[in-house]
């Protein structure tokens, strides 16, 4: 049929739950494309219903929610001017009480449901929640052991549970929560964490680098909305933690009230020897008390900020 | 249940690379920590170094100019080259992994061990 | 680097004896690893994060320390006990083993 086909992907589910994967392959993706799922190379394209349990949501197959019998291979073809491109997906769908104690371990998980916190650092786990933007996701709870995850050494930002001065009796089993609304329907997504503790350095001594900001200052009208992205690069395996704060505090929790600056959804891109981060901060609406404040970009033991000043008059 | 195994040539000539394979089942190398250790005879054990989940290499300092590890996640195996080798690398040489206990640094998991003699 | 001194390098000891096996890191470590090796065989995992006994290992074995002095104990030796023991730290790399402490029967 004159498709190349590109990789086998496998991934372990837990039933009754919600679950997506988006058919991207860059550079492939990113220009003029359609792309098409089918199941077990079928004929019959999935459904581009919303209604319908198994939906195509643009270039994202979504599962509300999978089901036992939705095993199986899974194709989304990749079609350009002068292309095509196949992708295969194994999808194999497991039964697993996460607070069932009889049951030591979970399955054969995919890499991001095993995660390591490095002994005496700040380090932090990230509930993975791969989802198109038809899928609305509430506040994510924790949990460890069945038993929601309180303290002052864990704080919840994001997508992520930040861990303080990690110990060895913060190994285990972890499990993060969250409401996934898709059409006006509510669905539990939860995924299971199993989180080993280890001495080692996680990035062999080397520090994150900042490309931007670089301690500088931005010129921004009173009133306006601002968005800045902090720029990051630091090696593959790295466990640094990287975030905005104003005055020594995460800005999620100096404007928890106001919720008037906020910080974005961390993203990152895969180079060969590195991984590219990009985490912004969301000024909603700059008002006077912002200019002259240095708004600190952290990562690990990296730290630059940005001041915001008023333009300068415009005297023509 | 997690198994390692280690291959390679017994007999190295000196000046020569020394290559060893280690083949995992049971878990995926895309997960912790993949470690080579070398015990030389009547003596003790040496750290030599790991590949983690990422790719990441840490080189024990003392072997650093001469050794490489590497990995093939599609074969879930990992690699050791030891350059200009001497009698001195003479020993058996383990592939290990930890984990046990959610603790990634207690090496539970063993390959049986391959010597590898270095002569001419 | 984190030179760790096993005391005593070897050991001549009876059956139902109570055995102390001593490392010394030359800086703090956080925990200490314990393996047991026996001859022609590769190393076990005996004691992890400084006094937790590996799957299978008798109770009559405990481990403690803390800094740079730890210790591995057997409260009464048993014949199978007879093996080669090292320490491992995790804490500062590189990752040193001790030397070895070689356990014989008297």
């Known amino acids: 049929d004159g498709c190349n086909d590109i990789f086998m992907k496998n991934e372990m589910l837990s039933a009754s739950q919600p679950f997506a994967f988006n058919c991207t392959f860059p550079p492939i993706t990113s220009g003029e494309v359609s792309v098409t799922w089918y199941k077990n190379s079928s004929k019959i394209p999935v459904s581009k219903i919303i209604q319908s349990r198994i939906h195509q949501d643009e270039t994202w197959i979504l599962f509300l929610p999978m089901e036992w019998g939705d095993s199986g291979v899974y194709q989304c073809v990749i079609k350009g001017r002068d292309s095509c491109h196949r992708i295969h997906v194994n999808l194999t769908v497991f039964e697993k009480q996460w607070c069932d104690t009889s049951v030591k371990g979970l399955p054969n998980l995919s890499d991001e449901y095993k995660q390591i916190l490095h002994l005496g650092k700040d380090d932090s786990l990230t509930c993975h929640l791969h989802f198109p933007k038809s899928c609305i996701l509430g506040p994510i709870k924790w949990y460890k052991d069945c038993n929601e995850i309180t303290g002052e050494r864990f704080t919840v930002l994001e997508t992520r549970l930040l861990v303080s001065n990690v110990s060895a009796e913060d190994r285990g089993n972890y499990a993060c929560q969250v409401i996934l609304t898709h059409s006006g329907k509510q669905y539990e997504v939860l995924n299971g964490i199993t989180v080993s503790i280890t001495e080692r350095a996680g990035y062999g001594g080397s520090v994150p680098k900042i490309i931007y900001p670089k301690n500088n200052s931005i010129e921004v009208q009173l009133g306006t909305t601002l968005i800045v992205d902090c720029n990051i690069t630091d090696t593959k395996d790295n466990t640094n933690l990287r975030c905005w704060r104003v005055n020594n505090t995460l800005v999620d929790d100096y404007y928890n009230e106001s919720k008037r600056i906020r910080e974005g959804v961390e993203t990152h891109a895969s180079f060969r020897e590195y991984n590219l981060y990009t985490v912004n901060i969301t000024f909603l609406e700059v008002k006077m008390e912002d200019y002259g404040l240095p708004f600190m970009c952290h990562a690990g033991v990296s730290a630059a900020y940005i001041m915001l000043q008023l333009p300068a008059p415009d005297f023509r | 249940q997690v198994q390692l195994q280690e291959s390679g040539p017994g007999l190295v000539k000196p000046s020569q690379t020394l290559s060893l394979t280690c083949t995992v089942s049971g878990a995926s190398i895309t997960s912790g920590y993949w470690n080579w250790i070398r015990n030389h005879p009547g003596k003790g054990l040496e750290y030599i170094?790991?590949?983690?989940?990422?790719?990441?290499?840490y080189y024990n300092p003392s072997l650093k100019s001469r050794v490489t590890i590497s990995r093939d996640t599609s074969k879930n195996q990992y690699y050791l080259k030891l350059s200009s080798v001497t009698a001195a690398d003479t020993a058996v040489y383990y592939c290990a992994t930890g984990g046990y206990d959610y603790v990634e640094d207690a090496l539970y998991y063993w390959g049986q061990g391959t010597l590898v003699t270095v002569s001419s | 680097d984190i030179q760790m001194t096993q005391s005593p390098s070897s050991l001549s000891a009876s059956v139902g004896d109570r055995v102390t096996i001593t490392c010394r890191a030359s800086s703090n470590v956080r925990y200490m690893y314990w393996y047991q090796q026996k001859p022609g065989k590769a190393p076990k995992l005996w004691i992890y994060?400084?006094?937790n006994l590996a799957s299978g290992v008798p109770s009559r074995f405990s481990g403690s320390g803390s800094g740079t002095s730890y210790t591995l104990t057997i409260s009464s030796l048993q014949p199978e006990d007879f093996a080669t023991y090292y320490c491992?730290?995790?804490?500062?790399?590189?990752?040193?083993f001790g030397q070895g402490t070689k356990l014989e029967i008297k």
């Open positions: 491992q730290q995790f804490t500062t790399s590189p990752y040193t």
């Open positions: 994060l400084t006094s």
């Open positions: 170094g790991y590949i983690s989940y990422s790719g990441y290499t």
